[in-house]
């Protein structure tokens, strides 16, 4: 009972994950730059995303622009769109092959697979995991590097986005559901023969170090 | 307009020492990195020393890093490089550089000083 | 440190011609570069940076490109204006390091 629990806890979380990394992916506020002209009239927010641009006036109004060459685009956001989408389909890959192991399907009889599917399961979530956070922690990264680069112009600058809280947070959903789905795979084969005992071993689930405290900018 | 005015260049020995000055003007120089990149006779330029505005950060490459040091004086709107154990391949001319909001890199250059190293 | 690799030293063209400077990193610099013109004379001024941003009043015969570690300063129709020494310079990291320069004169 404690290990089906665990099971829906873990593909709970995951999918909790994957809407957050979708969310993430999707959302134009990867970084943030606070624009203020001489003129507070021109006080604006710049969001750029993966996929589009958007300028916020101080009066409230939004306007996007989507990227319009795939090939002009800097190689850095090339790589994390993909590694962005390839993240998505291996955790909806991850989800059908336990949906196929689940205790509550039938799609597979024997116990012993039914605990293998699982376990695959949570290592292809493990995996969508870290492809999260490559691209999350790459952008960080080179806004961290930017805030502490002197010969970087102010208005080059930018903030961590609120899109990368979310692919923190999806990262780390991701790699606690998929462990939790690692480690109930031994107590779901243990009710079937003991030599199936051999064939699995429990492995510590993947830890994520979490972002240390970032610099962000006050604006006055 | 922006001005800056680099003073204090002159002959001096090996091993000894000398301050250069820079006058700014034209702007808010408290809101500005500034830095000072040298130039050696017929060779490329090269990077000396970048402070941050305010003057919390010094950033310096490893060839003056102990023997040079640079300061700002926000009332005077004046910066300085201090230049200890000078040495031959000190001899340059030594252009202040003031940052820029929108662009990267070394924005404004002064016209520069000569410093010459020889006994 | 990052070495920067300029190219050609120097090179002699017609009023009118395109001109093509390039500039290679030992590594990778993402586009953290700028472009100088150093006119005989006279200090330094910042012509591009981050590869391809134009200063305000710098003629748009000037434009920079980057392709992974290479970079391009082109100007597309030689001015005898544009006779002075052009320098790329990296700011990725610490330490910031010049190319050697391109002396560049008018046949």
């Known amino acids: 009972m404690a290990s089906a629990g665990m099971q829906i806890l873990g593909v709970v979380l995951t999918l909790l994950g994957w809407v957050n990394g979708l969310v993430s992916c999707a959302l134009p506020m990867w970084k943030v730059t606070a624009f203020i002209g001489n003129s507070i009239v021109v006080a604006q927010v710049v969001w750029e995303g993966l996929w589009m641009s958007c300028v916020v006036q101080s009066t409230g109004q939004m306007q996007c622009k989507v990227y319009d060459s795939l090939l002009a685009l800097p190689q850095d956001l090339q790589a994390a769109r993909a590694l962005c989408v390839i993240a998505l389909l291996v955790a909806l890959f991850g989800l059908l092959v336990y949906l196929a192991g689940a205790k509550c399907t039938t799609c597979v009889e024997e116990k012993d697979s039914k605990a293998r599917l699982v376990l695959t399961s949570g290592i292809v979530f493990v995996i969508s995991g870290v492809l999260t956070l490559i691209p999350v922690c790459w952008t960080a990264h080179a806004i961290i590097r930017d805030f502490y680069n002197p010969l970087v112009a102010e208005a080059q600058k930018r903030e961590l986005g609120a899109s990368l809280y979310l692919g923190w947070a999806a990262s780390g959903l991701l790699l606690l559901g998929g462990g939790l789905l690692c480690c109930t795979c031994p107590s779901g084969g243990s009710q079937g023969p003991s030599h199936y005992m051999a064939r699995y071993s429990t492995s510590a689930p993947a830890i994520s170090r979490g972002p240390s405290e970032y610099p962000t900018k006050n604006y006055v | 307009e922006v001005q800056l005015v680099e003073s204090g260049g002159g002959l001096v020995k090996p091993g000894g020492s000398l301050r250069l000055s820079c006058a700014a003007s034209?702007?808010?120089?408290?809101?500005?990195?500034m830095s000072w990149v040298r130039q050696a006779p017929g060779k490329r330029l090269e990077w000396v020393v970048t402070?941050?505005?305010?003057?919390?950060?010094?950033y310096y490459p490893d060839s003056v890093k102990g023997r040079f040091t640079i300061s700002r004086d926000e009332a005077k709107n004046s910066l300085y490089l201090q230049m200890n154990s000078l040495r031959a391949e000190d001899t340059a001319v030594y252009y202040c550089?003031?940052?820029?909001?929108?662009?990267?890199?070394?924005?404004?250059w002064g016209q520069g000083t000569l410093v010459t190293v020889s006994s | 440190d990052i070495q920067m690799t300029q190219s050609p030293s120097s090179l002699s063209a017609s009023v009118g011609d395109r001109v093509t400077i390039t500039c290679r990193a030992s590594e990778n610099i993402d586009s953290y570069l700028a472009w100088y013109q150093q006119k005989p004379g006279k200090s330094p001024q910042l012509l591009v940076y981050?590869?391809?941003l134009l200063v305000d009043g710098v003629p748009s015969r000037f434009s920079g490109s980057r392709s992974g570690t290479q970079f391009s300063l082109t100007i597309s129709s030689l001015q005898p204006e544009d006779v002075a020494r052009y320098y790329c310079q990296h700011y990725y990291s610490i330490p910031y390091t010049f190319g050697s320069g391109t002396k560049l004169e008018i046949k």
């Open positions: 034209g702007f808010t120089f408290e809101d500005y990195t």
């Open positions: 402070i941050s505005s305010g003057g919390g950060r010094t």
């Open positions: 550089i003031r940052g820029d909001y929108r662009y990267d890199a070394f924005a404004y």
């Open positions: 981050a590869s391809t």
